[in-house]
């Protein structure tokens, strides 16, 4: 498909006239950020945003590629360098714990510096690091987590938690050595760590206790509460703030948002992860673009600012499934929220960052024709006379061998939500990559993201930005909080 | 392998510092740019960017991705979206009328709008489209194209030649009609389209008439000229200009560069492509970097300044063949010539952009060990309970199966040269890929390079930054060529 | 509480046609895959067909055997799920249950079923 | 398409046995199977989904294992309330269910 109106070069050099005038245009801000705003698309390598691009797109009739997601409407780039102190493809942990926290750490490990070991429970003293959150919080801003995952994952815990294993979700997680020695579990943390205004996401399991039904699945047993210390979480964190309130539900959601009494809100939508937006029940559980607004609305109260987390965490669930479909449809709606935040904020006042934590082995090629769908296949057949699809992952749970041979795929087959798509290795779960990532920034202090730089940068653009611990002497006018 | 200062946080702190002192110091210069350089990594994404980083840094007996590669220290980048006119994932012919013309093209035609169709030469007139080259050439500076494929390859063809057919090499390689209806091939348009002072590659053998023997292999029947219409290009070449040298190996390269008298130098080093990188014989042909060298010796001499082309051509050629080694030293070899000319030149007058034509469905993954070779095992077992390498590609020739099974390998294997790493999909030639690639830059007007941009961007910015065509009302001081 | 309600069963002669109902309430109708699952006399569970939700457009799936005779659609207005039999065969004869998924842990399980309708093809 | 393989086709047992029933498919459904006990004359009901989770009110007695291609259901202690017949379902790719296990009581 070739349009009509690009086979005349005036359309590309008129677009990239326009494109240098907007360049040229761009004026670095001199002023500090009164709010901080990070966007994580978890496992959003560079290969999962053309893609979600072109898929979204195509959703609005579009040939795809031309189109702009909100995050490339952000007018600075960088690059991250993601591998951890002990690894050179990382995890979910570590690396929280550097676009958080400023600091990084060892695979699997959240909140602490490499000097803690994963599992090691006696490494955690005197080795925790602290997030731009909570030094946000500490500056008298109001802070807010949002996720598509339970709220004690992995790269949201980067933002309270300090644990030696990623996977101590709640204290059955925890061996029995472990609490003995003091350590506590992320959801434990999650309530004690420090005071967190709002809390969204999954992970309702982790704070009731074994045999604690769950409410929207009260007939599934292994839905329900996992506390084997008896503790009731939600009941604790309820009690510390009169202006608490905590939700399951969208309707609920939708309400505490607009109550003026909700000083502290916490909603917790699934037992574990929240369900893909695809499987997601729109009377049950929010998008990730209403809690994204739901916690806007929140935290633009305090006329201090705030700091917030959205996570766009089950992008990287997709791609581990090796479900292409799944990954892409998360990050389209991850981008659908960074777009929400940016019509509900100023970027006279809001520093805006989005990215990813580090990729994913997956792969676009084959050479389609513009407006091929991206799940559809490559023209033309492989050497074993088969069809393949653009879309495919270097290792994964999509490899599969039929009578000692690849198998053939169909573009109906390669088109549905539940496909594979195949690869090189037979994995479980398709495995993390090590690129460079991108960082995307709008707002004061924008213009800092630059280049190539190490993953810890970003959480020192973040307190730079708004003049935090360590950078209080940051010398912005207005000076961040002068606005109270 | 845990560095110890990396476990102390002030590790990271410092050097996040140091990073944001060095933002907060980078200054847009307002100055015209007098001299602009390209570096063009063919097929070289981020995911080869950070493999290379990683190789290049174990070479030098560091663990790899906490070095720098010299295109890291550019200070600005931004994402190219590579896509062409007709293709999702697009080709090197394609690409290069967008970064070399800044006007996206149809797969395989070069030098032309998309209004020109693949292999219809009666497509091509009024369809051509200007490169910065040329019009850097017209407004008197000096000119060069450097690059270890054939000269007459798709990207170098970019800069100077107008074909609906980037594989029409010599006339040998265009069809009878075609050539009847007024179609040059590629070799011819090097030498006429306009004058370039410095050529520098590979492809002989598409300059002098078929039984020409080559003079690096003059018993190899195959490497001998292939023209059909009996001219000797180099010779009618050398007859254009007084100052005019041509050079078939590096001895003659290396004086030749030299050489006050020479105002012009063709040096074509092997028949077709140059040899990889870990092939070459160091006595005959020279590197990249050498190649890079000579030219900037011979265009800095031009007081109105220079444009200079240098690609590291078979970056992708590894790719394609699956060999991840000779990709990643192709790339290190590329970057070796960056950092060259980073010493030869000043960024206070040359804009210096350095870019991928497009991507390679190539990964690297599997959570390996820091400090681990980038050709190594994956840690653990596959679910066929085989080993299996961080490396992968998702399609290509590297797929086999032996006994109905996927190939066990060993680090031994791996590591070799030869070494064919497995892909999901069997193809005789491994795919581009379609997501972005990163731009950095460095010099006047540098700061431009910002966002998501399309890749016909890079050519404007070119334009602009040293005041040529459209952008001669650049506004910049001082103004381009002041210098004469 | 999740329930499903099918109709449309009854006796049939073959190559004729017969189109089967299923009414669901409480719960979103539009957020949740549903299929038909048949089970012959004395046999074995079967499932014949798939409609996904709104977020994937209403996708439909088949199994082999009835691919081309029969249609799975669905009326979100009315909360509905149908399956349209045409050529029918005596070893179409079963019971027709309507199913809906549930979403755990990714999967697509099928875990609410109607009571079911019974269909007899014969002459 | 995956096609599961379900074993015995039948089997008797006396109150209080350990009774193990096992699905294979024909490629790895990434612990994605479930099992359903059916009774005369009424719809399946759903006892385990994604191998081993339980749903509420199905009695611990019931439990299922594995991965890949092989997955095993298990009742640790029969009663005379389970007799039924018993499928598995995969669901990673579409659906397929096991040919059905009845289970008597000897």
């Known amino acids: 498909i070739i349009p009509v109106e690009e086979e005349n070069p005036d359309f590309w050099n008129r677009q990239a006239a326009e494109a240098l005038g907007a360049a040229k245009k761009l004026q670095p801000a001199q002023t500090a950020a009164k709010n901080l705003i990070i966007f994580l698309g978890d496992g959003m390598g560079v290969s999962t945003v053309t893609a979600a691009r072109i898929l979204k797109g195509q959703k609005k009739d579009k040939l795809g590629p031309e189109t702009f997601l909100a995050m490339d409407r952000f007018p600075y780039v960088a690059l991250s360098k993601t591998y951890s102190v002990d690894k050179h493809v990382p995890d979910s942990g570590a690396t929280a714990t550097a676009y958080l926290c400023g600091v990084k750490g060892n695979f699997q490990t959240i909140g602490l510096s490499a000097a803690a070991r994963f599992n090691q429970c006696n490494t955690t003293r005197g080795n925790e690091v602290i997030s731009v959150m909570n030094r946000a919080k500490k500056a008298g801003k109001s802070v807010g987590v949002v996720t598509t995952t339970r709220v004690q994952h992995a790269s949201p815990a980067g933002a309270y938690a300090h644990t030696v294993n990623r996977n101590w979700y709640s204290d059955a997680d925890v061996p029995a050595s472990a609490r003995q020695e003091g350590c506590q579990d992320i959801a434990t943390q999650l309530i004690s760590n420090m005071d967190i205004d709002v809390i969204l996401g999954g992970g309702r399991k982790y704070m009731f206790p074994m045999g604690t039904p769950d409410p929207e699945y009260p007939d599934d047993y292994s839905q329900g509460g996992t506390r084997l210390d008896g503790k009731n979480l939600v009941q604790e964190w309820l009690a510390k703030h009169q202006g608490a309130r905590y939700v399951w539900n969208r309707t609920e959601l939708l309400q505490a948002s607009l109550d003026p009494s909700v000083t502290h809100l916490m909603g917790l939508f699934e037992p574990g992860d929240m369900k893909y937006e695809i499987h997601r029940d729109s009377t049950l559980d929010p998008s990730l673009m209403e809690m994204t607004e739901a916690a806007l609305l929140l935290l633009s109260r305090n006329p201090r600012g705030f700091f917030l987390f959205v996570e766009g965490g089950r992008i990287d669930h997709g791609h581990h499934e090796s479900r292409a479909y799944r990954a892409l449809t998360e990050t389209i709606m991850f981008d659908d929220a960074i777009e929400r935040a940016g019509q509900l904020t100023s970027e006279e006042d809001t520093l805006s960052l989005v990215t990813a934590d580090h990729s994913h082995v997956f792969s676009f090629g084959g050479y389609p024709l513009r407006g091929s769908s991206i799940f559809g296949l490559a023209p033309g057949k492989a050497r074993d006379r088969k069809a393949y699809t653009v879309l495919l992952y270097g290792n994964g749970p999509g490899y599969v061998l039929k009578d000692g041979a690849r198998p053939d795929v169909t573009e109906s087959e390669s088109g549905s939500p539940e496909y594979r798509q195949q690869s090189a290795v037979p994995l479980d779960g398709e495995t993390h990559a090590g690129e460079d990532v991108a960082v995307f920034a709008r707002g004061p202090q924008a213009h800092l993201v630059h280049g190539v730089q190490e993953q810890t940068f970003i959480a020192h653009v973040m307190a730079f930005a708004a003049c935090l611990e360590p950078y209080t002497a940051c010398d912005l006018a207005p000076r961040a909080g002068t606005t109270d | 392998i845990i560095p110890v200062e990396e476990e102390n946080p002030d590790f990271w702190n410092r050097q996040a510092a140091e990073a944001l002192g060095a933002a907060k110091k980078l200054q847009p210069a307002q100055t015209a740019a007098k001299n602009l350089i390209i570096f063009l990594g063919d097929g070289m994404g981020v995911s080869t960017v950070t493999a290379a980083r990683i190789l290049k840094g174990q070479k030098k007996d560091k663990l790899g991705p906490e070095t720098f590669l010299a295109m890291d220290r550019f200070p600005y980048v931004a994402l190219s979206k590579t896509y062409s006119v007709d293709k999702h994932v697009p080709d090197s012919g394609a690409t290069a009328t967008a970064y070399l013309c800044g006007v996206k093209g149809n797969f395989q035609t070069i030098g032309l709008s998309a209004a020109a169709r693949f292999n219809q030469c009666n497509t091509t007139r009024g369809n051509e489209v200007i490169s910065v080259m040329n019009r850097a050439k017209k407004a008197g500076k000096s000119v060069g194209v450097v690059t270890t494929t054939r000269v007459q390859h798709a990207s170098p063809a970019g800069a100077y030649a107008h074909t609906v057919n980037r594989n029409w090499y010599s006339d040998a390689d265009v069809p009878a009609s075609a050539r009847q209806e007024g179609c040059q091939d590629i070799a011819t348009q090097l030498i006429s389209n306009m004058d370039i002072d410095v050529i520098l590659g590979g492809g002989r053998k598409y300059m002098f008439p078929m039984g020409t023997p080559d003079p690096e292999y003059p018993d190899d029947y195959s490497q001998g000229g292939t023209r059909l219409d009996g001219k000797n290009l180099v010779q009618e070449w050398l007859a254009k200009h007084q100052g005019a040298r041509y050079v078939w190996n590096r001895t003659e390269l290396l004086q030749a560069s030299l050489d006050p008298s020479v105002t012009h130098l063709m040096g074509l080093f092997e028949p077709g492509d140059m040899k990889y990188e870990i092939h070459r014989d160091s006595t005959l042909d020279p590197s990249l970097m050498e190649m890079t060298e000579a030219a900037l010796l011979l265009l800095s001499r031009n007081p109105r300044g220079f444009f200079l082309f240098v690609e590291g051509g078979r970056i992708d050629h590894g790719h394609h063949e699956s060999r991840a080694y000779r990709a990643l030293t192709e790339t290190i070899m590329f970057d070796d010539a960056i950092e060259r000319a980073g010493q030869l030149t000043s960024e206070e007058d040359t804009l210096s952009l350095v870019t991928a034509d497009h991507s390679h469905v190539f990964s690297f993954g599997g959570y390996p060990l820091r400090g681990s070779s980038i050709f190594g095992l994956a840690p653990g077992k596959a679910r066929d309970r085989k080993a299996y390498t961080v490396l992968l590609y998702g399609n290509g020739p590297g797929y086999v199966l032996k006994d109905g099974a996927r190939p066990d390998v060993t680090e031994s294997e791996s590591g070799s040269p030869e070494y064919r790493q497995q892909s999901a999909v069997p193809l005789d030639g491994e795919t581009h890929a379609g997501e972005d690639v990163a731009v950095f830059a460095r010099g006047p007007q540098a700061h431009l390079v910002h966002g998501v941009q399309e890749q016909t961007f890079i050519a404007h910015v070119m334009a602009f930054a040293a005041c040529l065509e459209p952008y001669t009302a650049c506004d910049l001081a001082p103004r381009a060529g002041t210098t004469d | 509480e999740v329930q499903l309600v099918e109709s449309g069963g009854g006796l049939v002669q073959p190559g004729r046609s017969l189109r089967l109902s299923c009414t669901a309430s409480g719960f979103t109708f539009t957020d949740y895959y549903m299929s038909w699952v048949r089970q012959a006399p004395g046999k074995g569970l079967e499932w014949l067909a798939l409609?996904?939700?709104?977020?994937?457009?209403?996708?439909?799936e088949y199994t082999a055997s009835v691919k081309g005779r029969f249609t799975i659609s669905r009326d979100n207005s009315k909360n509905s799920l149908y399956l349209q039999m045409n050529s029918l065969k005596t070893e179409d004869t079963a019971v027709y249950y309507c199913a809906r998924a549930s979403f755990y842990y990714d999967g697509k399980v099928l875990a609410y079923w109607g009571q079911g309708t019974l269909v007899t093809v014969s002459s | 398409d995956t096609q599961m393989t379900q074993s015995p086709s039948s089997l008797s047992a006396s109150v209080g046995d350990r009774v193990t029933i096992t699905c294979q498919a024909s490629q790895d459904i990434n612990k994605y199977i479930a099992w359903y006990q059916q009774k005369p004359g009424k719809a399946p009901k759903l006892l385990i989904h994604?191998?081993?989770s339980l749903q509420s009110g199905v009695p611990s007695r019931f439990s299922g294992s594995g991965s890949g291609r092989d997955y095993t259901f298990t009742i640790s202690s029969l009663q005379p309330e389970d007799i039924a017949t018993y499928y598995c379902l995969q669901y990673d790719n579409l659906y397929t269910f096991g040919q059905g296990t009845k289970l008597e009581i000897k």
């Open positions: 994604y191998t081993s």
């Open positions: 409609i996904r939700n709104k977020a994937t457009g209403y996708t439909t």
